[in-house]
């Protein structure tokens, strides 16, 4: 039985050229997290954090994705094309798979502020 919930940073905005932290948190379960996969809106993988082998940044993103904090991901040098959905997939034992969603809007405006608040999607 899957008792856990994924909390995410929800809908966030950030400035073009800036950086943003994508963060998910799994709570209300004692399940062991074996791996966390981070995917972009087109389902391409950005990064994997394996519990035993550590972080693995995909080649296409190696110059502008930084691991962390924690199981989160920092996306740097943002472009307008980065606007869209991001998904964290928690592979756990024995529960199975949990998935969280974040929507990132990259803004041209210099007054755009990075807003981040945890919410349950």
């Amino acid at each position: 039985m899957m008792t856990g919930t994924i909390e995410t940073t929800g809908n966030i905005s950030a400035k073009k050229g800036g950086s943003v932290i994508l963060q998910c948190h799994l709570s209300s379960t004692m399940a062991q997290v074996t791996q966390v996969n981070w995917e972009q809106h087109d389902h391409s993988l950005l990064a994997i954090r394996n519990a035993e082998l550590g972080w693995h940044i995909y080649p296409a993103f190696k110059d502008r994705v930084a691991p962390g904090p924690g199981l989160g991901l920092t996306l740097q040098s943002l472009t307008m094309n980065d606007t869209g959905e991001y998904f964290c997939t928690y592979h756990t034992y024995p529960d199975g798979t949990y998935r969280g969603r974040i929507f990132l809007e990259v803004l041209e405006s210099s007054v755009a502020e990075h807003s981040a608040r945890f919410q349950i999607p």
């Epitope: 074996t34 791996q35 993988l45 994997i48 394996n50 035993e52 082998l53 550590g54 693995h56 940044i57 995909y58 080649p59 296409a60 190696k62 592979h91 034992y93």
Partner: antibody, heavy 123, light 109 residues
Framework: QVQLQESGPGLVKPSQTLSLTCTVS??????????WGWIRQPPGKGLEWIGS???????YYNPSLKSRVTISVDTSKNQFSLKLSSVTAADTAVYYC???????????????WGQGTMVTVSS | EIVLTQSPGTLSLSPGERATLSCRAS???????LAWYQQKPGQAPRLLIY???SRATGIPDRFSGSGSGTDFTLTISRLEPEDFAVYYC??????????FGGGTKVEIK
């Protein structure tokens, strides 16, 4: 489709270093989800995993061989290599390279293999 | 390390018969991490089954895998002449390290 090809000397003297290279064709070693591994098989015996490497250089090794093993990657040549130091006759085996799906979780396996290369350790 | 014990060591059967191969682990293995391979003389191993029960691409449906915990089974429902080979199970954990079983030879009776 992805193919792997081992290359290197077929004869190595005791106490020397065994060096092999695996060339990946039909796909990029920077595929992202895969590690790339080495497995060996002494004549008439079973399979023994040696170690595996990610395109970024991250590795994991068989603890029983770790002190003698170095696996490296050259993404510009789409190759990865094995070095095994201080070899003895017990290291005589067919050496295979293979694609390692350790990060695929429910598909963890070696799904593509090279044809293998026989390495004999003898003076 | 996790020791995988395969039995029997040799299985003598005729074409058309059913083959049942066993792989027993010294400690529990996630079924997601258990694979089976076929190896013919002078050839590299070929992946048959991953995740204990999923057939790899191009593998005929006469091959099936099952099991969980410490006991896993590879079944060949009706042996074809090309199925006579050595079969290895493998567990793909990182710590303890991944290991292969000692193999089961399926030979023509």
């Amino acid at each position: 489709q992805v193919q792997l090809q081992e290359s290197g000397p077929g004869l190595v003297k005791p106490s020397q270093t065994l060096s092999l290279t695996c060339t990946v064709s039909g796909g990029s070693i920077e595929s992202g989800v895969y590690y790339w591994g080495w497995i060996r098989q002494p004549p008439g015996k079973g399979l023994e995993w040696i170690g595996s490497i990610y395109y970024s250089g991250s590795t994991y090794y068989n603890p029983s061989l770790k002190s003698r093993v170095t696996i490296s990657v050259d993404t510009s040549k789409n190759q990865f290599s094995l070095k095994l130091s201080s070899v003895t006759a017990a290291d005589t085996a067919v050496y295979y390279c293979a694609r390692d799906g350790v990060l695929t979780l429910n598909k963890r396996s070696f799904d593509i293999w090279g044809q293998g290369t026989m390495v004999t350790v003898s003076s | 390390e996790i020791v995988l014990t395969q039995s029997p060591g040799t299985l003598s059967l005729s074409p058309g018969e059913r083959a049942t191969l066993s792989c027993r682990a010294s400690q529990s293995v996630s079924s997601s991490y258990l694979a089976w391979y076929q190896q013919k003389p002078g050839q590299a191993p070929r992946l048959l089954i991953y995740g204990a029960s999923s057939r790899a691409t191009g593998i005929p449906d006469r091959f099936s895998g099952s099991g969980s915990g410490t006991d896993f089974t590879l079944t060949i429902s009706r042996l074809e002449p090309e199925d006579f080979a050595v079969y290895y199970c493998q567990q793909h954990t990182v710590r303890p390290p991944l290991t292969f079983g000692g193999g089961t030879k399926v030979e023509i009776k």
